[in-house]
C-alpha cells in the first residue's frame, strides 16, 4: 500500500536571469527511493538522480541546471520560457511511483522585486539542510 506523500515547494516565482531551487520531499513512508526524475512542463526530462549511480543532467540543460541540494534541482539563468509546471517523480521500493508538481513563474526583474513580499513561505520543512539521508535511503 502506498502510504507516502510528496511535499513540494508548490507555486513559486523567481526573477528572470536568476536561479531557483526546485524541491520535493517524500514523507510518511519507509520505502527506499531508487530514482528521482525531474521533468519540465512539456514532459522533457531535466535530470535524473539515481540512488546508486548519482546524477545525470540532460544535455539540453547541462549549462544551467545544477544538481541539488539533496534530491532537488537548481535551475539557473532563468528565462521567461522556463515558466510552467515541473514534476518530480520518485521511484521507490516497494511502494512504486510518487509524483509531485511545482509551478514556476519567471517574472521580469522589476515585477519580481515588487511581488516578492506577497509570496507565502512554505510551512514545515526546511529545505536548506536537505540531503540524501533525509530521503529514506535504507541500505
Amino acid at each position: 500500500m502506498m502510504t507516502g506523500t510528496i511535499e513540494t515547494t508548490g507555486n513559486i516565482s523567481a526573477k528572470k536571469g536568476g536561479s531557483v531551487i526546485l524541491q520535493c520531499h517524500l514523507s510518511s513512508t519507509m520505502a527506499q527511493v531508487t530514482q528521482v526524475n525531474w521533468e519540465q512542463h512539456d514532459h522533457s526530462l531535466l535530470a535524473i538522480r539515481n540512488a546508486e549511480l548519482g546524477w545525470h543532467i540532460y544535455p539540453a540543460f547541462k549549462d544551467r541546471v545544477a544538481p541539488g541540494p539533496g534530491l532537488g534541482l537548481t535551475l539557473q539563468s532563468l528565462t521567461m520560457n522556463d515558466t510552467g509546471e515541473y514534476f518530480c517523480t520518485y521511484h521507490t521500493y516497494p511502494d512504486g511511483t510518487y509524483r509531485g508538481r511545482i509551478f514556476l513563474e519567471v517574472l521580469e526583474s522589476s515585477v519580481a522585486e515588487h511581488s516578492a513580499r506577497f509570496q507565502i513561505p512554505i510551512e514545515g520543512r526546511d529545505y536548506k539542510d536537505d540531503d540524501d539521508k533525509h530521503h529514506h535511503h535504507h541500505h
Epitope: 526530462l45 535524473i48 539515481n50 546508486e52 548519482g54 545525470h56 539540453a60
Partner: antibody, heavy 121, light 106 residues
Framework: EVQLVESGGGLVKPGGSLRLSCAAS????????MSWVRQAPGKGLEWVGR??????????DYAAPVKGRFTISRDDSKDTLYLLMNSLKTEDTAVYYC????????????WGQGTLVTVSS | SYELTQPPSVSVSPGQTASITCSGD??????GCWYQQKPGQSPILVIY???KRPSGIPERFSGSNSGNTATLTISGTQAMDEADYYC?????????FGGGTKLTVL
Amino acid sequence: EVQLVESGGGLVKPGGSLRLSCAASGFTFSYAWMSWVRQAPGKGLEWVGRIKSKTNGGTTDYAAPVKGRFTISRDDSKDTLYLLMNSLKTEDTAVYYCTIDPLYDLLTGPWGQGTLVTVSS
Amino acid sequence: SYELTQPPSVSVSPGQTASITCSGDKLGDKYGCWYQQKPGQSPILVIYQDSKRPSGIPERFSGSNSGNTATLTISGTQAMDEADYYCQAWDSSTVVFGGGTKLTVL
C-alpha cells in the same frame, strides 16, 4: 567488474531474422540505458538504437536505417539486452556491440567483444 | 538526419599535442563523447559528457564542446595513442557517430 558479452550472431540470408543477446554483469543492469552499435567490415561505428531504463519509461529509439525492422528489448530479471533483427539486408552485415550509454559517472563500462552478423545469399 | 563531420586523418609527432575536431549543427546542445579504437579491438570510451574521463583513461586526454564543434585533445601524444577516434553526439532521443579520424603518430 563491468562486463558485456554479446552472442547470437551468424550467417543469415537476406530477408531473414536473427536475435542477438547481450549478457551484462558487474553493475545494476536495470538502471542502465543500453544501446546497440554496429561496425561493418572496414567501416566506422554506427548507432543502431537504444532502450532506456524502466525508471525512464523503458522506451526505445532507433536509427533511420533500421527503424521498423529491428526491435530492442531488455529482461532486467536476467540482466540481458536483446536485438531482434527482421527483414535483414546485406548492408546489415557488421559486428554488433551492446554498450552502456554514458549517463552516469559511476557507470561507463567497456564494450563487449561484439558478435558478427553476416547477411548473404 | 543529424550528421557529424570529422577529418579523415590527423598526424602528430610524439610528445606534441593532437587535436581532433568534430562538427555538427548545435553540437554544443548535446553531449560530446569520444571513442578510441585500435585495429582488431573493440572501441574504448575516452571522453564522455563533453569533457569527463572514465577511470583508467590517462589525463593527457581531454575534451571540450561548444557551439558547433567538439574537440578531443591529446597532450604529449604517445605512440600507443595511434588509433581511430570516433566522436559521438549523445542526447536523450538519439545518438550519432562521426565518420572517424585516423590518428597517426609520426
